[in-house]
Structure formats: structure tokens, C-alpha cells
């Protein structure tokens, strides 16, 4: 069922079908006998009770006040009253733009990131049973789409998709043809969510070790979901059975990015593990960044400046 009209201030375009639905609808069915009234006041005018006799354009149903169509002089305040329940709306009817297929003041703006999923579906659940056909226009040019009941665009966004998309529903009521237009201003922007991945800590790390012992080299980065973090060492990774890449750990940050950590475990350190580069790389669509570790025998650490020590 169509949800009730909860917004207290509503702007609509002249010449289109429009409805107000009060928000105690389920309650109203329970108390069928209760008197339910709709009122309008505009400017200094007192409340005027609305009924089908007050205008051929107005229809009253259980929970709904319908306009066929709404016109400029329908601007004003509307009230629904039932027992001790009252709901009020302020309705502003604006002029249709005669030179365009849509009215600029009645446009919903959406920002879509390039390559992200982009969807426009032309639906109108309230008038669904009365709609004969629906057309989708881009910048007021009709798009040729297969489904003329609910035209839909579903794709990965491209910059060329930017523009004004208007869903126009054509419907009949009491022998007259009406249309309802819903327009979206779609702006395609670059992927704003991507950060340049950052490897945490110094770019070059000398690690003091003892032969025969084990060491864990921790590489941490702040990165995007798609970014990869990996270790490179030796001629061909995996040639040394004493070197193991541990499973990557990822924690999502409050900003929706990822804090990743990948440990390289070197067991039973031998001479061949000393003074060689163990590189940790983070790669993204923006490029790569690398951090290097060098294992140095504890006795040799005296030759290295203090600020490059890592333990």
C-alpha cells in the first residue's frame, strides 16, 4: 500500500494528478462510522469543507483526497479531521515550465560515482492501475527502452550518463488523459571514495635478529577494499621453506576504509636471510607504494644510525 503523506510542506506542479493521504488510515477503517472530514483554507479564508461537489477535480476516498488535476488555485492549507485526530499540510502549486518536459523546481538531484551502479526505475505505485504507458526521457529526448510499463536503466555509470531523466506516466481518468512527471538530475562524479593507500611506518627498516631464531615482519597499510598488499623477496617467492606469508588481517575503519596487516614470518634465520630486501607492496588503481625490511645481525647493529632501528 502507498505510504501516507507525512511531509507537512509539499510542492507540486499544476496540471498533474495529485493526492494527499492521511496517516491514520488503518485507524479509520476500524471506526468506519466516525465522521471524517477534509478542509481547505487559503489566506484569510476560513476552513472550507471539501467534497466532490466543491469541485469536479476533487475526489474523496477512504484515506485520500485526490486532485484531477491539481491547479494553481489549489495552493493553501489542507486539514484532515477524524474524532480527535488532525493532520495538516501546506500545499504549494507551482507553474509548469511550458518550454521543457519538466519543471526545474520539481527535480530530485542524485550524485552517482563513475563506474558505480546507476539505476533509474519509472514507478508510481499509487496510480499504477491507471497508468497506460510510461516513457523515460533524457534531457527531454525519449529513450527507446524495451519495457513501456516500467522503463528502467541499470548500468555502471559513465560520465556521458549525466543529465536530466524524466519519467512520464500517462494515465486515463474519467475519459481524460493526464500525465505525471518525475525528474532526476543525475550528476556523475569521479570515484570519491578511493584514498591513496598508505603504508604505515618508515620506508626502510633494519631489523636486529639472531641466527637460528624467528622473526615476524609486520606490514600495515590504510587502503581501499580493492587494494592488495603483498610481500616480495628473493628471486622467486616461496623458494625458501623457512619464509611464510601469514593470512592478511583487515579491519574496517569508521570512514569505510580498511586497515590491513600482513606478516612475513621467517623461521630459523640463516646467513642467506641477512642483508637482503624483504619488500612489502601495496597496490591500487592509483599506483604502488613499497616498504623495505633488512635483517641485520644484532652484533652488526652498532654500524647503523639509531633512527632506522626496528625491533
Amino acid at each position: 500500500a502507498e505510504s501516507c503523506t507525512s511531509r507537512p510542506h509539499i510542492t507540486v506542479v499544476e496540471g498533474e494528478p495529485f493526492y494527499l493521504k492521511h496517516c491514520s488510515c488503518s485507524l479509520a477503517h476500524e471506526i468506519e462510522t466516525t465522521t471524517k472530514s477534509w478542509y481547505k483554507s487559503s489566506g484569510s479564508q476560513e476552513h472550507v469543507e471539501l467534497n466532490p461537489r466543491s469541485s469536479s477535480r476533487i475526489a474523496l476516498h477512504d484515506c485520500v483526497l485526490e486532485f484531477w488535476p491539481v491547479e494553481l488555485n489549489d495552493t493553501g492549507s489542507y486539514f484532515f479531521q477524524m474524532k480527535n485526530y488532525t493532520q495538516k499540510w501546506k500545499l504549494n502549486v507551482i507553474r509548469r515550465n511550458k518550454h521543457s518536459c519538466f519543471t526545474e523546481r520539481q527535480v530530485t538531484s542524485k550524485i552517482v560515482e563513475v563506474k558505480k551502479f546507476f539505476q533509474i526505475t519509472c514507478e508510481n505505485s499509487y496510480y499504477q492501475t491507471l497508468v497506460n504507458s510510461t516513457s523515460l526521457y533524457k534531457n527531454c529526448k525519449k529513450l527507446l527502452l524495451e519495457n513501456n510499463k516500467n522503463p528502467t536503466i541499470k548500468k555502471n555509470a559513465e560520465f556521458e550518463d549525466q543529465g536530466y531523466y524524466s519519467c512520464v506516466h500517462f494515465l486515463h481518468h474519467n475519459g481524460k488523459l493526464f500525465n505525471i512527471t518525475k525528474t532526476f538530475n543525475i550528476t556523475i562524479v569521479e570515484d570519491r571514495s578511493n584514498i591513496v593507500p598508505v603504508l604505515l611506518g618508515p620506508k626502510l627498516n633494519h631489523v636486529a635478529v639472531e641466527l637460528g631464531k624467528n622473526v615476524r615482519l609486520n606490514c600495515s597499510a590504510l587502503l581501499n577494499e580493492e587494494d592488495v598488499i603483498y610481500w616480495m623477496f628473493g628471486e622467486e617467492n616461496g623458494s625458501d621453506p623457512n619464509i611464510h606469508e601469514e593470512k592478511e588481517m583487515r579491519i574496517m575503519t569508521p570512514e569505510g576504509k580498511w586497515h590491513a596487516s600482513k606478516v612475513l614470518r621467517i623461521e630459523n634465520i640463516g646467513e642467506s636471510n641477512l642483508n637482503v630486501l624483504y619488500n612489502c607492496t601495496v597496490a591500487s588503481t592509483g599506483g604502488t607504494d613499497t616498504k623495505s625490511f633488512i635483517l641485520v645481525r644484532k652484533a652488526d647493529m652498532a654500524d647503523i644510525p639509531g633512527h632506522v632501528f626496528t625491533r
Epitope: K115, F159, E190, D191, N194, V196, E225, E226, V228, Y230, K247, E248, R250, A260, T281, A283, S284, T285, G286, G287, T288, D289, T290
Partner: antibody, heavy 115, light 113 residues
Framework: QVQLVQSGAEVKKPGASMKVSCKAS????????ISWVRQAPGQGLEWMGW????????NYAQKLQGRVTMTTDTSTSTAYMELRSLRSDDTAVYYC????????WGRGTLVTVSS | DIVMTQSPDSLAVSLGERATINCKSS????????????LAWYQQKPGQPPKLLIY???TRESGVPDRFSGSGSGTDFTLTISSLQAEDVAVYYC?????????FGQGTKLEIK
Amino acid sequence: QVQLVQSGAEVKKPGASMKVSCKASGYTFTNFGISWVRQAPGQGLEWMGWISAYNGNTNYAQKLQGRVTMTTDTSTSTAYMELRSLRSDDTAVYYCARGWFFDIWGRGTLVTVSS
Amino acid sequence: DIVMTQSPDSLAVSLGERATINCKSSQSVLYSSNNKNYLAWYQQKPGQPPKLLIYWASTRESGVPDRFSGSGSGTDFTLTISSLQAEDVAVYYCQQYYRTPYTFGQGTKLEIK
């Protein structure tokens, strides 16, 4: 729209150097790396290396290490690829491409190395 | 380096028929941390730069007809053209972007039977 515009064709002598430019427009240059890919006549695609437009970090294919240099000029959103000590087997169309899967390509620059 | 091997080297298919190109990587390009396959497919016509068709192994690039689809995971991948059109005649390449150097397959030449 998003595009990469490359410099024109070149004819070089063996031992010489070449420098191809690739000007980006329609997107934020520093958000994407630029890869260079070459294609010898009638052959497949060979990745030469790439550069991060954000921080200038480079990563080159092993076989070109020492002969190739990739640079960027963020003020003009332009990437450059220089290849030195040219040989006849460097004759190829050189492409610049965006990102790590290459969604935008330049039209290519034909470089002919001949004595 | 990760070696990409395509099969077959060339393929002749009738118009309207299905075309299938395979690509095998020498090591997995599936990243367990995000379950993404770092594999792309390109189409190249004579005298033109390659054109991206598929990335993340199965995501179709915007503007690419839906007769093109990508599948597979780990080391084995497939590009399928469900109903071959005349304009699909080209060389097709797979490429891994999991580890540098980013390597391409040798290419598969697709022709009309």
C-alpha cells in the same frame, strides 16, 4: 570526456633515445596510475611499467629496467615515458593506459627504430 | 612473474553462435581478503588501441554489450560471447593486475566461420 592524448609518431636510429608524452583530461590525474604498454608489429601486448601520478612511484618490467624512465607532470596532467639505447626490436606502437585494469587508452604512438 | 596462457590461439565461429575463450594464470589471481579476481579482458581491432570489456573477472565495462560475459576464479577464466556479431571480429586478450609486472595473455584471434 575522459581521454589520454599521445604525442606523434617518431623515427629513431639505434642507440638513440625517445620520449613519448600522454596528456590526460576529463578526470583527476593524480587519482590513477598510468601504465605504458607496447605492441610490436603483428605481436601481442607487453606491459612496460607504470607510474603513480599521485606520488611518482614507479614499477618497471624487469627486461626494461635501466633503459626506461617514467615521469609525470601534475601541473599539465601529462605522463612521459623515455626509452634509451633503442634497438630495432623496440619498434612498436606505444600506448599509455589508465589504472590497473586499463579502462582508458591513448591512441598509441608508433616508434620506428631503423638505421 | 604471473604467466597468462590463452586458448585457443585462434577461433572461427558462425554468426549468432557462441564463442568461448579461455585464460589460465600460472598462479591464483584471487585475493582472499576481498574475494576479488584481478583479471581483465580486452578486445583489439586492427589499427585501434585495446578496449576494456570485463574487469574483476566478471564485471562488464559500461557500454559493452551484454552478449559479452566473463566468468571463472583463481587460475581459470573464460570470456563468452553469447551470440557472435560481425563487429566482434578482433583479437581478445586477458590480463592480470594482481601482481606487477601486470601480464597479458598472448591473444586469441576471433574470426567468422
